[in-house]
Interface confidence: low
Amino acid sequence: QETDSVVSSVTTKVKGVAVTNTSKLGFRIWDVADYVIPAQEENSLFVMTNVILTMNQTQGLCPEIPDATTVCKSDASCTAGSAGTHSNGVSTGRCVAFNGSVKTCEVAAWCPVEDDTHVPQPAFLKAAENFTLLVKNNIWYPKFNFSKRNILPNITTTYLKSCIYDAKTDPFCPIFRLGKIVENAGHSFQDMAVEGGIMGIQVNWDCNLDRAASLCLPRYSFRRLDTRDVEHNVSPGYNFRFAKYYRDLAGNEQRTLIKAYGIRFDIIVFGKAGKFDIIPTMIN
């Protein structure tokens, strides 16, 4: 048999809306544009499941969040001009009141500085468990000029509107419930949603092209790619920060800092195709 490796392209689309109601944000709707960051990635997508928001930051002077390195008794404890790797800004050298009894070193920074000591639990967007992910995958075996897509020819528009992937009942539906993806990998979505993580959606296109083209079918499997060692639980999960900038009525620059925790879904497409070739047979 002659063999060839798969060439693939993937696009994704997430659907789902979440509702939150907190004292800080009030009643709020979260849609795809809010929680899929960025809007497009290659063979991957990130769904925000938890968040720490620091609203209305402006450039200025403010006390650091108290921790072992920032708590001070007097200015002597604060080195002016220093900017530690874990600090939120550049130290002014002053020791100022963080609250009634605690003093911390003052920094020039985006103020107020972020307090990420307590990650929301349960996850802020716990409703993401029921969001759905459509994976569109086109594959090509160049050696045999064979191409196919995972939305199979006999999948109707009606079926696509209502189906959810299930290994037993709907093994070729390309729409996945996020909670099921994590569950199929043997993990709890709600646990993973708190601090984030990385999930792999594996699409296997092993095809014997001596058989009919209709028999070349995608097979889906799922695994957690960031599985952490219970014994070594340093820096767990997956998160990053970004900011949304705007100006207040007076024209001063402000921002909302977002520390986004979430699940990155990596779509990993692999496969080999084989086809009988008379030439190697004759040579042998």
Epitope: L152, P153, N154, K168, P171, F172, D206, N208, D210, R211, A212, A213, S214, L215, C216, L217
Partner: antibody, heavy 119, light 107 residues
Framework: QVQLKESGPGLVQPSQTLSLTCTVS????????VHWVRQPPGKGLEWMGG???????DYNSALKSRLSISRDTSKSQVFLKMNSLQTEDTAIYFC?????????????WGQGTLVTVSS | DIQMTQSPPSLSASLGDKVTITCQAS??????IAWYQQKPGKAPRQLIR???ALVSGTSSRFSGSGSGRDYSFSISNVESEDIASYYC?????????FGAGTKLELK
């Protein structure tokens, strides 16, 4: 809903040709493959051959020399022709289709038609 | 052609028993195996596809497993309606081939 129905003569003379028709409804022959499976009385199942959505055919190597499968998509019919029949070809002949997606076995079956080869 | 060796040819069970049927392929069939139930005078009915995926409407008492060349099919808590013949089918390679069948009877 998906239905398949076999029709043809119940009795065929030895050395003659068998012609069977499978009339389908509820799906398009250009989308799905249809296969023929037979079962001699009291024995097991044997895949004979099939015609794919694109019109290509495949046959069981043991029957290939005397078997032909074709179709008329406008009439939603699949035809089986097998020549040089012998008594060991006496069997129930089923036409079948894959379940939801081509390639995961045979999910839909006709009720079968008994063909007896005898003089 | 791929040979499917199905065993046992027949099986006696009491109601409530668990029974297991095996099929061994003459080469790796990459999990492309389906299991069928056939009652006398009826067409076969597909119960399982792709080794372990239950076809819609199939009782969860039926299950399948295996990989490579070796596959098995089980019925837990046998009921009288399960009395039938059972066949495996490999569809990894043409020609498709069935196992010789297993006849399940009541003790």
């Amino acid at each position: 809903q998906v239905q398949l129905k076999e029709s043809g003569p119940g009795l065929v003379q030895p050395s003659q040709t068998l012609s069977l028709t499978c009339t389908v409804s509820g799906f398009s022959l250009t989308r799905y493959d249809v296969h023929w499976v037979r079962q001699p009385p009291g024995k097991g199942l044997e895949w004979m051959g099939g015609i794919w959505g694109d019109g290509s055919t495949d046959y069981n190597s043991a029957l290939k020399s005397r078997l032909s499968i074709s179709r008329d998509t406008s009439k939603s019919q699949v035809f089986l022709k097998m020549n040089s029949l012998q008594t060991e070809d006496t069997a129930i002949y089923f036409c079948t289709r894959s379940l939801d997606y081509s390639g995961d076995g045979f999910g839909y079956w006709g009720q079968g038609t008994l063909v007896t080869v005898s003089s | 052609d791929i040979q499917m060796t199905q065993s046992p040819p027949s099986l006696s069970a009491s109601l409530g028993d668990k029974v297991t049927i095996t099929c061994q392929a003459s080469q790796n069939i990459n999990k492309y195996i389906a299991w069928y139930q056939q009652k006398p005078g009826k067409a076969p009915r597909q119960l399982i596809r792709y080794t372990s995926a239950l076809v819609s409407g199939t009782s969860s008492r039926f299950s399948g497993s295996g990989s490579g060349r070796d596959y098995s099919f089980s019925i837990s808590n046998v009921e009288s309606e399960d009395i039938a013949s059972y066949y495996c089918l490999q569809y990894d390679n043409l020609p498709y081939t069935f196992g010789a069948g297993t006849k399940l009877e009541l003790k």
